[in-house]
Amino acid sequence: NSLPTENRLVNSCTQARKKCEANPACKAAYQHLDSCTPSLSSPLPSGESATSAACLEAAQQLRNSSLIDCRCHRRMKHQATCLDIYWTVHPVRSLGDYELDVSPYEDTVTSKPWKMNLSKLSMLKPDSDLCLKFAMLCTLNDKCDRLRKAYGEACSGIRCQRHLCLAQLRSFFEKAAESHAQGLLLCPCAPEDAGCGERRRNTIAPSCALPSVAPNCLDLRSFCRADPLCRSRLMDFQTHCHPMDILGTCATEQSRCLRAYLGLIGTAMTPNFISKVNTTVALGCTCRGSGNLQDECEQLEKSFSQNPCLMEAIAAKMRFHRQLFSQDWADSTFSVMQQQNSS
């Protein structure tokens, strides 16, 4: 479960920029485009519009370079650098035959068997809830335990530092094995088991990770869009968790939607379970005071709380997690290749 290197990506933006820098024309065009890219939080320092003739010309020159189709990876080293390059080039997409709603992340799907040692779970009561069991499985794994303790420490205390808490949460969901991270957060609880539901809701330390006073959802999104990482994770979520129909079909795949959902944890747009008695998730924000943007705000809110693709993806994963413990395991160590394409 090591971090992917640039070389493992089909076309990483960092690699693509290196190639571009070896070509004088490409290098000059990229540097010019870099000055054209507006920061979403501040105006262009040069005052040059991103759609000015010179910027359009620079964009046109990059159309034939590998930069135009470059991607980043959620678990790569130097992810911030890669995303900065992606967003420098991204405005080019609006100038030609390219989709505007493409996730900056490449889907390199690695289907690994999920090996877990259940022998030590015998120290738990047989009727212990599954959230407790998945928490124990994390504790029994050195890497998962270390990463979980790191965010537990950063997110605890009366006066926790929220930015550090969020950074450690991101680190956990980026670096822990996907099976452990998903097991910990998407553990199934019996409807009447409020203790289990509360444990699940507290997994991401919401008292520290989420703002104490709920901000307006559109303000939260604007804040998110001003940050390349948060903007990337939000676009990833919008790409993969868009519902195609009322059945809950996802625009790409359930597994990719879940990956995108988990990728938002630790950003400004951190979602969480809203109650201990069901599996509804929501952003920690409100649409009060949205004025004439009320509809837009509610749509953003519903893309989490009433999204049939996301709801079905979470339900399917919880069903899978329940199945893991519903059989009589002859062997305490088992290996599962998940049906859902490594989700």
Epitope: M244, I246, T252
Partner: antibody
Framework: QVQLVESGGGLVQPGGSLRLSCAAS????????MHWVRQAPGKGLEWVSV????????YYADSVKGRFTISRDNSKNTLYLQMNSLRAEDTAVYYC????????WGQGTLVTVSS | DIVLTQSPATLSLSPGERATLSCRAS???????LAWYQQKPGQAPRLLIY???NRATGVPARFSGSGSGTDFTLTISSLEPEDFATYYC?????????FGQGTKVEIK
């Protein structure tokens, strides 16, 4: 490569039956909702049926309800459409489709209902 | 059932012109579940737009979708020779899912 291939079409008499198959390859079939869509000669598209990724939910157009049955075998990566009590108005090219952001359609199989 | 009515039935335009196709629903449709397809003679349909305004994979930027409630629009900003085809809207918001009757975009 990623593709859907329909088979099982042909000429059948009114009142007869046919079973269409759609073989999927190049993607994880069990992850996707699947559809059947048909098109009568010279006419527009008509949605026929849909089945959820695990087969637990199925829905039909009013025109085929009670006569057609959609099913899937995820172990064989195959989608089926069992068509009974066929009528002349069922004559069409039948497409199976994966309707997501990167959609896939089969090449279609022609079903002709005629005496 | 939700009935989708497309207009016009036929649109005669020249390459380079702008095409505006309309799709009207008999009742409100959640824009998440409104799609547009392109079909050329002898070929299977191809998804162009999903969620009323999102381009499907590989679809050129000259295609755009908009609208909400009962009125939806597909716009082709500047027609290319390969864009002359029949276009269908589809709703997947209520069962049975339904298609519009289609708009044929032909060369003038």
């Amino acid at each position: 490569q990623v593709q859907l291939v329909e088979s099982g079409g042909g000429l059948v008499q009114p009142g007869g039956s046919l079973r269409l198959s759609c073989a999927a390859s190049g993607f994880t079939f069990s992850n996707y909702t699947m559809h059947w869509v048909r098109q009568a000669p010279g006419k527009g598209l008509e949605w026929v049926s849909v089945i959820s990724y695990d087969g637990s939910s199925t829905y039909y157009a009013d025109s085929v309800k009670g006569r057609f049955t959609i099913s899937r075998d995820n172990s064989k990566n195959t989608l089926y459409l069992q068509m009974n009590s066929l009528r002349a108005e069922d004559t069409a090219v039948y497409y199976c489709a994966r309707i997501v952001r990167m959609d896939i359609w089969g090449q279609g199989t022609l079903v002709t209902v005629s005496s | 059932d939700i009935v989708l009515t497309q207009s016009p039935a036929t649109l005669s335009l020249s390459p380079g012109e702008r095409a505006t196709l309309s799709c009207r629903a008999s009742q409100s449709v959640n824009s998440h579940y409104l799609a547009w397809y392109q079909q050329k003679p002898g070929q299977a349909p191809r998804l162009l737009i999903y969620g009323a305004s999102n381009r499907a994979t590989g679809v050129p930027a000259r295609f755009s979708g908009s609208g909400s409630g009962t009125d939806f629009t597909l716009t082709i900003s500047s027609l290319e020779p390969e864009d002359f085809a029949t276009y269908y809207c589809q709703q997947m918001d209520g069962f049975p899912f339904t298609f519009g009757q289609g708009t044929k975009v032909e060369i003038k």
